[in-house]
Interface confidence: low
């Protein structure tokens, strides 16, 4: 074992941690669970207690971020560098923090709690055998209820345990229905939907209404993320994968590999992979927050890394079932804070405690519980009137859409967001964008298919900005943004993850505010935004007003372009020039003639 | 004008190391990211990696995980690539390209001959 | 071997049209938009074009690109003797940048 230089520990034994945030990846109770493990590793063997607070005075905050996340030592997206933590000390000593960007679970793939069936409620084990096939997923296979359900065991051949997998065909969360399964087909605005739907509304939440007709009833509920099945990457990130499903003309019930050269699983988020072409990766096995916060809160204790393979504290992740502390790991410690001055107890169970399980029988009705993994900022109000038809089928590429005069960008009245991206300016509208140069005497190019480009975005966007040093791209719809790198996604994520708190419906636009920093509007507020750390200042909030005067209170979109702020409201636009820290409106025009240069015919 | 200036060429034993420079000029260099691409003789252009001026962040390609590293000094602003273990199926032009939309300056290439 | 499939050849006369295929599969072309690359003999490669369709300023009008589904095409509307040389597509296959095999251009 090796200590940081000066043996650096705790000068007392009650050590505090608090969690400061979530991971999605996992229900909050098996994070907590988690961590309260790995702690109860360590006070097994030496004198220390650990106990979990709700403040930052604590000595050990727990955090889950990505990339820069505010102490300089940033994460490195998903693999490579898992978690890291800082020796003990004040301040950000002590500290653990989780790169968010990993799949997060129990080591052996998605932790996907169960209800009914006869497991009492203990989560899916993936991959499982059933009928000599294995599944690396839900299946609905051997039901002819459409219900997804998995074994709770690796073979369920031989063990006949299994539970239901969230389903929106079993229950609901949230909304107006009681948890009410839903129902389909149902009608919304006049269409009909079987299935989930995020139209209506604004912030990418998927609903769907548990009576025959939304447009009579008014009743609705949030249909349940499925964890095991929601794919990453592809062109249809944060999508189910469908199984059965059609490639190459052969049907695939689980995800596969066939087609890619790298031997990655991925599925199709339709039937048909041959005719649609929308896919994604399946999640892997996840790294095993279990294990990971053990070694992490080794090094928060005082311990560095060890030599010894076989020890936790050695660099590099290995899944194990077996008991985590090596003979060197307690030697390590106990240099350091000495043994437990009682008998050793019993090592502690890890099992992650179950929420009881109804009736072992196949449900006929929906659970009256609410999920308690539900976003706390999540949706609570009816679908709020939007689009009224599905979104324009198209080609899978970034190919123009048959021009017709509702797809002139001089034809739109007002654009759901504008942002300045490369030298471009780009103007989006309901699922399509068209892009526009200036000087060139040509009209907007396009419109192209949101989908082709960014195709984890919804149709409907607030506001979009590109941060020039780093080229990721923000956009934003209700309560969530999408952070694209090139071809990569992070996202969705949920404003709170930004700083942002609840009462903030909306992003309705940013400006640049010095290198690394930019400005976001929210209505008549702003604030003061850290693009590296991706976090608001709370203490920067300030009146749009306050700081440009002038400008119409009301605007739905704000955006940069040739280094000056665009306030727009209704077709019209307020441009804000900066000349020695004045703000001031010196244009308003009409964003159609006076940006876009388009004909006044 | 903008421009890359790779380091001069380069004759190597099998297992050796390389280390290829690239100082860019006339634009900013923490505004784009570095791409490094080789073309063994004869044949076609291979991704090897590509780098953020900006933060540092790197992503490699597959093939050379383990053996490639890319950093940047922004206070020369210029790019590095270091490839460990040569074999002789390494010899190739090594190109640096700034990298944004597409590859769209690129140096004017480093021959590394690895060679017993 | 190559992951986006070029034809290895193809040539025409001066003024004739030149179309450059470069087939991919939905994991590259089909999700993201392909840029093209000319590369004279001894000389480094040159963006020629991006986004499946823009020219670099300098870039003559000749050149234009389009992407349909799983393939991208490059055409030279009037071919110049003065663009023999090599041609390379390249898109994203999730993380990582891929290029086509190359298509040698002959102008007769």
């Known amino acids: 074992f090796q200590t940081f230089e000066g043996d650096l520990k705790w000068h007392h034994h009650n050590i505090t941690y608090w969690i400061q945030n979530y991971s999605e990846d996992l229900p909050r109770a098996v994070i907590d669970d988690a961590f309260a493990r790995a702690f109860a590793l360590w006070s097994a063997v030496t004198p220390l207690t650990f106990t979990r607070v709700y403040s930052r005075d604590a000595d050990i905050v727990i955090q889950f971020g990505v990339a820069e996340h505010g102490d300089g030592y940033p994460f490195d997206g998903k693999d490579g560098l898992l978690a890291h933590a800082f020796p003990p000390g004040p301040g950000i000593q002590g500290d653990a923090h989780f790169d968010d960007d990993e799949l997060w679970s129990l080591g052996k793939g998605v932790v996907v709690p169960t209800r009914f069936g006869n497991a009492d409620g203990a989560a899916c084990h993936f991959p499982f055998i059933f009928e000599g096939r294995s599944y690396s997923a839900c299946t609905t296979d051997g039901r002819s209820d459409g219900l997804p359900w998995c074994s709770t065991t690796a073979n369920y051949d031989t063990d006949d345990r299994f539970g239901f997998c969230p389903s929106e065909r079993l229950y609901t969360q949230d909304g107006n229905a009681d948890g009410k399964p839903c129902q389909f087909p149902f009608i919304f605005q006049g269409q009909s939907y079987s299935a989930c739907t995020t139209d209506g509304r604004s912030d990418g939440y998927r609903w769907c209404a548990t009576t025959a007709n939304y447009d009579r009833d008014k009743l609705f509920g949030f249909c349940p993320t499925r964890a095991d099945s929601t794919v990453m990457g592809g062109n249809s990130a944060g999508e189910l994968c469908v199984f059965p499903f059609t490639f190459l003309g052969k049907e695939y019930s689980t995800c596969t590999s066939e087609g890619r050269g790298d031997g990655r699983l991925w599925c199709a988020t339709t039937s048909n992979f041959d005719s649609d072409k929308k896919w994604g990766f399946c999640p892997d096995q996840g790294y095993s927050l279990f294990l990971v916060a053990a070694h992490e809160f080794g090094h928060a204790l005082g311990l560095d890394h060890s030599s010894v393979p076989e020890a936790l504290m050695y660099p590099m992740y290995r899944f194990t079932e077996g008991p985590p502390l090596h003979k060197d790991d307690v030697n390590g410690i106990r240099h350091l804070y000495g043994p437990r001055p009682e008998p050793e107890p019993r090592p502690p169970t890890t099992t992650t405690p179950q929420p009881t399980a109804p009736p072992t029988v196949c449900p006929t009705g929906p659970p009256t519980v609410h999920p308690s993994e539900r976003p706390t900022a999540g949706p609570t109000g009816p679908p709020s009137a939007g689009p009224t038809g599905p979104p324009t089928a198209g080609p899978s590429t970034a190919t123009t859409v048959p021009l017709s005069p509702v797809d002139d960008a001089c034809n739109v009245n007002i654009f759901d967001a504008i942002a300045e991206i490369g030298n471009q300016l780009y103007l989006f509208k309901d699922g399509k964008y068209w892009r526009f140069s200036e000087g060139r005497g040509s009209r907007p190019q396009g419109p192209f298919l949101i989908a082709d480009k960014w195709p984890a975005l919804p149709r409907k966007l607030d506001s979009v900005f590109e941060e020039r040093l780093s080229k990721k791209l923000f956009f934003f719809s209700g309560r969530q943004v999408w952070v694209y790198t090139g071809a990569s996604v992070l996202g969705p994520r949920r404003l709170d993850k930004l700083g942002l708190g609840a009462d903030v419906a909306q992003v309705t636009g940013a400006l640049r505010s010095g290198r690394g920093k930019m400005l976001l509007f929210s209505g008549r507020r702003l604030w003061r935004f850290d693009v590296k750390a991706q976090m608001v200042d709370p203490r920067s909030a300030s009146e749009v007003d306050r700081m440009f005067p002038g400008v119409p209170l009301d605007t739905h979109d704000v955006f940069q372009y040739r280094e000056k702020a665009y306030f727009c409201q209704d077709r019209f636009y307020w441009r804000v020039s900066s000349r020695s820290e004045l703000n001031q409106v010196d244009q308003v025009g009409y964003v159609t003639y006076d940006i876009l240069q388009c004909p006044e015919d | 004008q903008v421009q890359l200036v790779e380091s001069g060429a380069e004759v190597k034993k099998p297992g050796a190391s390389v280390k290829v420079s690239c100082k860019a000029s006339?634009?900013?260099?923490?505004?784009?990211?570095i791409s490094w691409v080789r073309q063994a003789p004869g044949q076609g252009l291979e991704w090897m990696g590509w780098?953020?001026?900006?933060?540092?962040?790197?992503n490699y390609a597959q093939k050379l995980q383990g053996r490639v590293t890319m950093t940047t000094d922004t206070s020369t602003n210029t790019a590095h690539m270091e490839l460990r273990s040569l074999r002789s199926d390494d010899t190739a032009v090594y190109y640096c390209?700034?990298?944004?939309?597409?590859?769209?300056?690129w140096g004017q290439g480093t021959t590394v001959t690895v060679s017993s | 071997q190559a992951v986006l499939t070029q034809p290895p050849s193809t040539s025409g006369t001066p003024g004739q049209r030149v179309t450059i295929s470069c087939s991919g599969s939905?994991?590259?072309?089909?999700?993201?938009?392909v840029n093209w690359y000319q590369q004279l003999p001894g000389t480094a490669p040159k963006l020629l074009i991006y986004?499946?369709?823009h020219r670099p300023s300098g870039v003559p009008d000749r050149f234009s690109g389009s992407n349909s589904w799983n393939t991208a095409t490059l055409t030279i509307s009037r071919v110049e003797v003065g663009d023999e040389g090599d041609y390379y597509c390249?898109?994203?296959?999730?993380?990582?940048?891929?290029f086509g095999g190359g298509t040698k251009v002959t102008v007769l």
């Open positions: 006339g634009y900013t260099f923490t505004s784009y990211g």
């Open positions: 780098i953020s001026a900006y933060n540092g962040n790197t």
């Open positions: 939905t994991f590259n072309i089909g999700s993201n938009t």
């Open positions: 390209a700034r990298d944004y939309y597409g590859m769209d300056v």
């Open positions: 390249q898109a994203w296959d999730s993380s990582a940048v891929v």
């Open positions: 986004s499946d369709s």
